[in-house]
Interface confidence: medium
C-alpha cells in the first residue's frame, strides 16, 4: 500500500462572493492541473445538499442536477485542464444566497472549496418633494433594495431620528418609503440610504432657499448649482426643473449630462449661463406673470445623489398694473 | 499514511444481518468516494458497491442490490455496511477501499479485509 | 451489464521476458479502464488508470493501452516480484465490473 507523500490534503478554503440580483456571477475555485478531473459544485443548506454542476468523465454531468440551476450554470470547459473549475451562474435571485461547495478530484489531489454567495440590490433611490393639503413632506425611496438597509437622516446636519418608515416585501427584496414632515421648516434635509453588502450609499439633499419676490413681467433668476463634493467628474446625472402647483409638479425643463441635451417645456425658460463647467444649473424665468407664484424644484440625480433645490416665488402686481386697477 | 480498517465480520446465518464497518486515516475521508469490494478466497474481485464524498450518490452491483447499504459518517471518518438478508454466496472477504478521485470509480488503497461468513 | 473478459487465465514465464496480457469489453467503454495487481496473500494495488496512465510509484516496465473494447497490460521485463495476478476494471458506469483475473508466474 502506498503512503499518503503521492497526495496533497488541502483545506476547506472559503470565499466570500457578492452578486447582484438577476446579474451573473463567477464563483470561483482553481486546483493543481492533474488528470482525470472531477468536478462537484454543490449548494449546501441547513438541511440538505443539492448538485449544482458536475463534470467528470471529460463532461458535465447534469442528470442530477437540482431543477432550480437548469440552464442557468456552466464550467470554463476550455480552462479546466489549466486549473480552472470556477462556476459561471447565470440570473442570480436572492434564493441562490447561501454556502457552494467545490469539490475538485485529481489524480494528485483532492479539495474541497467553499464559496459564500451573498447577493444584493440596490436600485437607485429617489428622494421626494410632496405638497398634502398645509402639509410639506420629503419622501426617500428606494424601490428595490436588498439586504435592508441603513436609513439616516440630517437635518442641518444633524442626525434626526423622527421619519415615518413603510415597508414592502416580506423577505426581500424590500421597497422601503421613508417620510419626514418638513412643514414650515425652512431648514436643509439630507436623506442618506446605505446598502452595506454592496456597499454603495445614495444621498438625497433637501434646500429651501429664501423666499423670492418679483414684479409682474420682470424676470427671475432661480439658482441650482451641483455641489463637487456630491458628483465625481465622470459621473452621469440629470437636472430637472419643475413647478409644484397645488401638489402636482410639471417640468419646465430637463438635462442629461451624458447626451448634454435640454428640452424646454415652457418658452420663457432659459439656463443662466451656458452650461460649458456642467455645474450651474441656474433657470432664468422671463416675463413674469402672477400665474407664475409658486414654488420652483430643481432635482439633479445621479446613482449616488439627489440634490433637490426649492425655490418660492410670490410675483405681485406691478405698478402699472395696480393703478390700472 | 492511508489506513483502512475493515471490522464487522463473522459467521452468520443465511437471512441473518451484519453491518461492517470501516474506519478511515491518513486522508481527508470526506475528500473521497469508498467502496466496497469483495473476494472468495482464491476466486476474482468481486465490486460491491460506492458511495460518493458526501454520500449524496451512491450505486450497488446486481448481486446485492435491494439487500445492501452502503453509507458514511464523515464526522466519524467512517465508512459501513448493512448486509440484510445475507446468503450463502455472499462468503467473502470485504474490502473497503478508497477511490482516487470520487466520481472516477477506481481504488487506490485498500484495507486489509475482514471475512463474512454465511453458513448455516 | 457489460462483461469483462481476460485472457489467458494464467501464464508462466521467465524472468526478461515481455508478458501481455489482455482485456476485452462487451461494450465499448472509452478509456475508463484501470488495472490491477494482487500478489499471493495481499490486497490488490492499482497500477494503471485512464488504460494507460501509469500510477504514482508504479515501475516504468508496466504499460498499457487501447481503448474502447480492446485493452492489454504490458510487462516490458518482467521480474520475480510481478508474480501475482492481474485485473481489469471498468470505471465508466456501474457496475464497475472488474475481469476475472489473469495469473502470472515464473517459469
Known amino acids: 500500500i502506498f503512503l499518503s507523500a503521492f497526495f496533497t490534503y488541502v483545506p476547506m478554503n472559503e470565499q466570500i462572493i457578492i452578486g447582484r440580483l438577476g446579474e451573473d456571477i463567477i464563483l470561483p475555485s482553481s486546483f493543481e492541473r492533474g488528470s482525470e478531473v472531477v468536478i462537484h459544485w454543490k449548494y449546501q443548506d441547513s438541511y440538505n445538499s443539492y448538485n449544482v454542476h458536475s463534470y467528470y468523465k471529460g463532461s458535465g454531468r447534469l442528470e442530477s442536477q437540482d431543477t432550480r440551476y437548469a440552464n442557468r450554470t456552466s464550467l470554463f470547459y476550455n480552462e479546466i485542464q489549466n486549473g480552472n473549475a470556477s462556476l459561471f451562474f447565470r440570473r442570480l435571485s436572492l434564493l441562490d444566497e447561501g454556502i457552494y461547495t467545490c469539490y475538485v478530484g485529481t489524480a494528485i489531489q483532492a479539495i474541497t472549496n467553499k464559496v459564500v454567495l451573498k447577493v444584493g440590490v440596490f436600485l437607485t433611490p429617489m428622494m421626494k418633494y410632496e405638497k398634502r393639503n398645509t402639509n410639506s413632506f420629503l419622501i426617500c425611496n428606494v424601490l428595490s433594495v436588498y439586504p435592508r438597509p441603513i436609513i439616516t437622516w440630517k437635518m442641518d446636519n444633524t442626525p434626526i431620528s423622527e421619519n415615518n418608515m413603510q415597508e414592502t416585501g416580506s423577505l426581500g427584496p424590500f421597497s422601503i418609503n421613508s417620510t419626514l414632515n418638513i412643514t414650515g421648516s425652512n431648514s436643509s434635509y439630507e436623506c442618506t440610504i446605505e446598502n452595506s453588502l454592496l456597499k454603495q450609499t445614495w444621498t438625497g439633499r433637501w434646500t429651501m432657499k429664501d423666499g423670492l419676490h418679483k414684479m409682474q413681467s420682470e424676470h427671475v433668476s432661480l439658482s441650482c448649482e451641483l455641489v463637487n463634493d456630491y458628483f465625481s467628474p465622470n459621473q452621469d446625472f440629470k437636472v430637472t426643473w419643475s413647478r409644484m402647483e397645488s401638489g402636482i409638479s410639471s417640468i419646465l425643463a430637463y438635462y442629461l449630462s451624458s447626451s448634454q441635451n435640454t428640452t424646454f417645456y415652457e418658452s420663457r425658460f432659459s439656463w443662466n449661463k451656458e452650461l460649458k463647467n456642467q455645474s450651474d444649473f441656474s433657470m432664468n424665468l422671463t416675463d413674469l406673470s402672477l400665474s407664475d407664484s409658486g414654488e420652483y424644484l430643481c432635482n439633479i440625480s445621479s446613482d449616488e445623489y439627489t440634490l433637490l433645490t426649492i425655490h418660492t416665488v410670490h410675483v405681485e402686481p406691478s405698478q402699472e398694473t395696480a393703478s390700472d386697477n | 499514511q492511508v489506513q483502512l480498517v475493515e471490522s464487522g465480520g463473522g459467521v452468520v446465518q443465511p437471512g441473518r444481518s451484519l453491518r461492517l464497518s470501516c474506519a478511515a486515516s491518513?486522508?481527508?475521508?470526506?475528500?473521497?468516494?469508498m467502496h466496497w469490494v469483495r473476494q472468495v478466497p482464491g476466486k476474482g474481485l468481486e465490486w460491491v458497491a460506492v458511495i460518493w464524498y458526501d454520500g449524496s450518490e451512491k450505486d450497488y452491483a446486481d448481486s446485492v442490490k435491494g439487500r445492501f447499504t452502503i453509507s458514511r459518517d464523515n464526522s466519524k471518518n467512517t465508512l459501513y455496511l448493512q448486509m440484510n438478508s445475507l446468503r450463502v454466496e455472499d462468503t467473502a472477504v470485504y474490502y473497503c477501499?478508497?477511490?482516487?478521485?470520487?466520481?472516477?470509480?477506481?481504488?487506490?488503497?485498500w484495507g486489509q479485509g475482514t471475512l463474512v461468513t454465511v453458513s448455516s | 451489464d457489460i462483461q469483462m473478459t481476460q485472457s489467458p487465465s494464467s501464464l508462466s514465464a521467465s524472468v526478461g521476458d515481455r508478458v501481455t496480457i489482455t482485456c476485452r469489453a462487451s461494450?465499448?467503454?472509452?478509456?475508463?479502464l484501470a488495472w490491477y495487481q494482487q500478489k499471493p496473500g495481499k490486497v490488490p494495488k492499482l497500477l494503471i488508470y485512464?488504460?494507460?496512465t501509469l500510477q504514482s510509484g508504479v515501475p516504468s516496465r508496466f504499460s498499457g493501452s487501447g481503448s474502447g473494447t480492446d485493452f492489454t497490460l504490458t510487462i516490458s521485463s518482467l521480474q520475480p516480484e510481478d508474480v501475482a495476478t492481474y485485473y481489469c476494471q471498468k470505471y465508466n458506469s456501474a457496475p464497475f465490473t472488474f475481469g476475472p483475473g489473469t495469473k502470472v508466474d515464473i517459469k
Open positions: 477501499a478508497k477511490d482516487l478521485i470520487s466520481g472516477i470509480y477506481y481504488v487506490d488503497h
Open positions: 485512464a488504460a494507460s
Open positions: 461494450q465499448g467503454i472509452s478509456n475508463y
Open positions: 491518513g486522508f481527508t475521508f470526506s475528500n473521497y468516494g
